[in-house]
């Protein structure tokens, strides 16, 4: 059995699950351990920017005390020389994001650090239901490099239910990653940053158009999973990664065969963390229901390397370290569908704190 975070003592053994995924086990993970933030920064305040050279050279495990931004040379800020005065934003200049979109200075932003001992076990959080995610090779899907990430646009028909009466349809999926020697997930667990993270973005069926849902509670829902290194190649991810060379240039878009989107997520859809946050890129609209799975998805070292070196972004720089710093919870509670807190009792705690999308 893969071991979870709860109640781990001493040296845990890393079990293999048939789907090639493991539970979140911080002590076991090959990527570097990032120290958790000591406390939430003051309201509406971004952590200080960290110089890229300082960040890459001083790998003392302390950098996530300020959850640093991606280095300036990775995603340099842009002027008007490209795109005719576009509202540019970059991972190297997240302190400027509120100027691009005021919502980025909101109180309930994403991503966040998931502190396991502070999660609230919520028994009403049922296993997620995915319908229609097993796509056939035809029709083909658009895979693009938009300069910030690699994006797979999903067709109509992928339906997901967070719970009774909370139905969504998938719009697209994208990834966040680091470099070969620095992890790049957006969410962290007890301060630990994983090599990479997948986001599947969904629109509530209560809204016919995206712009109507932005900023509305429960209007958007994102399924997130951490990518972790393992010896075996992940065949599902290979169907994406094998095409990255074709979209290496910013702005490239190709058509690839349809694939089983559910195979890109963990097999265990019953154990997850849930909170209300925001889009992690401008316009940083709030009201987004986040589901972060406890089980990680396993990719080979070669696959993670391919992800981190294949794409190019603005100003002929590598598209790397495309993650936002973790944001203060500002009083939010992260709920868990299982007893994740190490000292959790068999009975659910804070059971009345459970929220539903749209509350």
């Amino acid at each position: 059995q893969p071991q979870g975070l709860s109640g781990m003592q001493g040296e845990p053994s890393l079990g293999d699950s048939s789907s090639g995924e493991d539970e979140l086990g911080v002590d076991v993970l090959p990527s570097e351990e990032d120290a958790p933030e000591e406390a939430d920064p003051p309201d509406g305040e971004d952590p200080p920017e960290v110089n890229s050279e300082d960040r890459m050279e001083e790998s003392l495990g302390l950098e996530d005390l300020s959850t640093p931004e991606a280095p300036e040379h990775s995603q340099g800020s842009h002027g008007d020389e490209k795109g005719g005065g576009h509202s540019h934003w970059s991972y190297g200049g997240t302190l400027l994001w509120p100027q691009v979109s005021p919502a980025c200075a909101g109180r309930f932003q994403s991503p966040v650090d998931i502190r396991l001992e502070r999660t609230a076990f919520c028994r009403t959080l049922q296993p997620l239901e995915l319908l229609g995610y097993e796509l056939q090779p035809l029709p083909e899907l658009s895979l693009s490099n938009n300069g910030h990430t690699v994006q797979l646009t999903l067709p109509p028909g992928l339906k997901m239910a967070l719970g009774p009466g909370q139905e969504y349809r998938a719009l697209q999926l994208h990834l966040h990653w680091g470099t070969s020697d620095h992890p790049g997930s957006e969410h962290t667990v007890n301060g630990h940053r994983f090599p990479a993270e997948i986001h599947v973005v969904h629109l509530s069926t209560a809204f016919s158009e995206l712009h109507e849902a932005l900023g509305r509670p429960g209007g958007l829902a994102v399924l997130a999973a951490f990518l972790q290194e393992s010896p075996e190649e992940n065949s599902a991810y290979e169907q994406l990664l094998s095409h990255l060379e074709e979209i290496s240039e910013e702005g490239s878009k190709i058509e690839i065969p349809g694939l089983d989107v559910s195979a890109l997520l963990p097999s265990d859809l019953s154990r997850y963390y849930r909170y209300e946050g925001s889009l992690t890129t401008p316009p940083c609209s709030q009201g987004v229901i986040w589901t972060v799975f406890n089980e990680t998805v396993k990719l080979s070292a070669k696959q993670l390397h391919t992800l981190s070196v294949s794409l190019w972004g603005p100003r002929d720089s590598r598209l790397q370290l495309n993650f936002r710093a973790t944001q203060p919870l500002n009083g939010r509670t992260i709920e868990a569908s299982f007893p994740a807190a190490e000292d959790s009792s068999p009975e659910p705690v804070h059971v009345n704190s459970c929220f539903t999308a749209g509350d």
Epitope: Q75, H78, K82, G83, G84, H86, S87, H88, W89, S90, V100, S101, S142, S144, N145, N146, G147, H148, T153, L171, Q172, V201, L203, L210, H211, E212, L214, G215, E250, G251, T281, P282, P283, S285, G313, P314
Partner: nanobody, 117 residues
């Protein structure tokens, strides 16, 4: 509802110029500024192909067949995408579509460009 409306197409002689415009109407301001915007074209009997794009990160990319002749730009204040087409060739004849891509795709109805003497 977000709607994209192209204009500026027409009949032009080889070597001539046209300026296509695409206006986004509806409550799209909170999407448009953060989207990748693009022009595609579809010639009779052929697949739709990407002509030019401005990514959400601000970079521009052109298909090899239009490089140096076409220029894409955007005006976020007016929610408008422009395509300046110079030195037009008969093979540029197609229906041109504008596209806004932010979490989901938005498409215009298209405008016909015909290059013929």
């Amino acid at each position: 509802q977000v709607q994209l409306q192209e204009s500026g197409g027409g009949l032009v002689q080889p070597g001539g110029s046209l300026r296509l415009s695409c206006a986004a109407s509806g409550n799209s301001a909170n999407i448009f500024s953060f989207a990748s915007v693009a022009w595609y074209r579809q010639a009779p009997g052929k697949q739709r192909e990407l002509v030019a794009v401005i990514t959400s990160a601000g970079g521009t990319k052109y298909s090899d067949s239009v490089k140096g002749r076409f220029t894409i730009s955007r005006d976020n204040a007016k929610n408008t995408i422009l395509l300046q087409m110079n030195s037009l060739k008969p093979e540029d004849t197609a229906v041109y579509y504008c596209n806004v891509d932010y979490l989901q795709d938005y498409w215009g109805q298209g405008t016909q460009v015909t290059v013929s003497s």
